[in-house]
Each structure stands twice: as structure tokens, then as C-alpha cells.
């Protein structure tokens, strides 16, 4: 099939002991090969500080996956979710202030 770019959505969880869990979800993409990783100041976080979900079919002939990490509250601006898929790429910020989600469809 033809390439379908992912929809990328970044969300924050509640604060716990000064930390926030940030989750980056990529959905509705094809083919299934994708790079999804958290970066701090543009540098990829080490693997042992990130948790990945499996790349799974989402029932529409496309796929979905996610990556999560914990960051210190107040440092949200330093972090981005980096995505590479079928020659396209993008960086996605952690939502700041009262906004708790951000999504973007790649073209």
C-alpha cells in the first residue's frame, strides 16, 4: 500500500513527586517501520529512561505505537518527541501551561 504518515499526539500525566510522565503516540501510519524517541535539548534520551509500546495494527490497515518518559516538572520546554517515518521526520513539543495535549498530522 501507499505511505500513510502518522498522527503524532503528545500528552502529559499528573505530577508525581515533581515529575511528569510524557507520552508520545503515533497512530494511523503505514508502513509499520517508525522511529519514535524522546529528546532532551535535541539529544536522544538513553534507552533505559524510555518505555516503548509495541507497533500494533490499529484495525484500519495502519499501525500505532507510543513512547513514554518521566521528566522534571518545569523542564517541559527542553523535551521533544522525535519521529521518523518513510523519509519524513518531525519534532513534537511537550504541551506547556494548561494545555495537556498536542497533535499533528504529518504530510
Amino acid at each position: 500500500g501507499s505511505t500513510v504518515p502518522p498522527m503524532v499526539n503528545v500528552t502529559c500525566s499528573e505530577v508525581s513527586e515533581g515529575n511528569i510522565t510524557v507520552t508520545c503516540r503515533a497512530s494511523s501510519f503505514y508502513p509499520r517501520n517508525i522511529t519514535l524517541t524522546w529528546r532532551q535539548d535535541g539529544v536522544s534520551l538513553s534507552h533505559n529512561t524510555q518505555q516503548w509500546g509495541d507497533v500494533l495494527p490499529d484495525g484500519n490497515g495502519t499501525y500505532q505505537t507510543w513512547v513514554a518518559t518521566r521528566i522534571r516538572q518545569g523542564e517541559e520546554q527542553r523535551f521533544t518527541c522525535y519521529m521518523e517515518h518513510s523519509g519524513n521526520h518531525g519534532t513534537h513539543p511537550v504541551p506547556s501551561g494548561n494545555s495537556h495535549h498536542h497533535h499533528h498530522h504529518h504530510h
Epitope: 535539548d41 535535541g42 539529544v43 538513553s46 529512561t49 527542553r78 521533544t80 521518523e84 513539543p93
Partner: antibody
Amino acid sequence: EIQLVQSGAEVKKPGSSVKVSCKPSGYAFTSNNIYWVRQAPGQGLEWIGYIDPYIGRIIYNQQFKDRATLTVDKSTSTAYMELSSLRSEDTAVYYCSRSGERSNFDYWGQGTLVTVSS
Amino acid sequence: EIVLTQSPATLSLSPGERATLSCSASSSISSNYLHWYQQKPGQAPRLLIYRTSNLASGIPARFSGSGSGTDFTLTISSLEPEDFAVYYCQQGGSLPLTFGQGTKVEIK
């Protein structure tokens, strides 16, 4: 081959501004942050700030926040660093650098000497 | 701000000798955020070691890095003529990003 090519040396008067350019090649311009660092003659390295060319996010060293302006032109894949209200202590070599997969500065430009003198 | 203090300021050694450079941080740093750079006169710095102990691409195996917490070390097992340069440690864990003041390795 990844390269970052910077604009040429500048001589400026105190109180004026300077704008240094940095043109990377050999990779997708918007996939990595561009950092700026300066080095006064015979001194160490000082981080100025960085910009994410994809989303335009800028993080400054607070010491430079009021005088440095980082921008990118995605159409020409060029990054810029402008420093205003120049004083003699700003005389330095200014470097651009690319964020790496595992370190903050993995490739560097050749440097641009900015001399501030009356 | 995390202050990185490098010692000694200057290291005078002969080719073939072992060089040990220290970098001490004012606050604890995760090993993922400590990097080393080499700078020769008139040149830009170049990445030498990333994340405390990993050699950057093209860097010979005589260079090694170690450490944790607040104390980190760069070792050159046997100095080659091209190794005489200034070495900087850098931390990326906290803003502002900071560098040590450098250690100059000079020919004795």
C-alpha cells in the same frame, strides 16, 4: 558528509549588532537542533542557546537572553545568531554546532571571529 | 548552574606517556550527560567521548573516559603527537549547558 559552514569574520563598533550565519549540509536541516557557542580569545567555551529548526523553539542561556536572537530560514536551510548592543567583551569566535544523537554538540562550524572595537 | 572544574589546567607530558585529565562537577551529573571535546589551535572543538565513556566516530582507542556522580576522567593511554591540544568536559544535564575551563596537554 556533514558540514556546517559559517559566514566570514566581522569587525563591529560598540553598541552595534552582528548577525552570523550557519549553513549545514549533509543531513536534513530540520532534524537536529542548532546550537551556538562562543569562545573569547584564549578562553573557554560558553553556550549561548539553541534552536529547533522544525518547530522554531528557542532555548537561551539566560546570560544572553536579552541580547541574542536565534532564527532559522528553512527555505535556505540556514541558521542565524544575532547579538546586539555589542561591547568589547563580546570579541570572540562564534561557533554553530549540531545536536547529536547522543551528545549536545556532534558537528561544529569552522567559527566566525567577531571583533568589537571602536 | 553546574560548574565544571578541570584539573590540572596544564599537563606537560612527552609522547608515549599516559595522560589523566579530571573534570569535577559542582552537582551530581548522570553519566549520560557528560561529554569530552578536543580543540586544537585555530580549529573548532570536536567531539571525543560522549556519555562519559563512549568513543565518538573516528576517535582512536587510546582515548577512554570514566566516572560518575561529580568526578569524571579522560585518559589517553599513550600520547601521540597529534594529541597535544586542549580538552574540555561538558555537561548537558542541566541548563545552562556548561563547559569546563579546559586542560591543555602540552609537549614536555
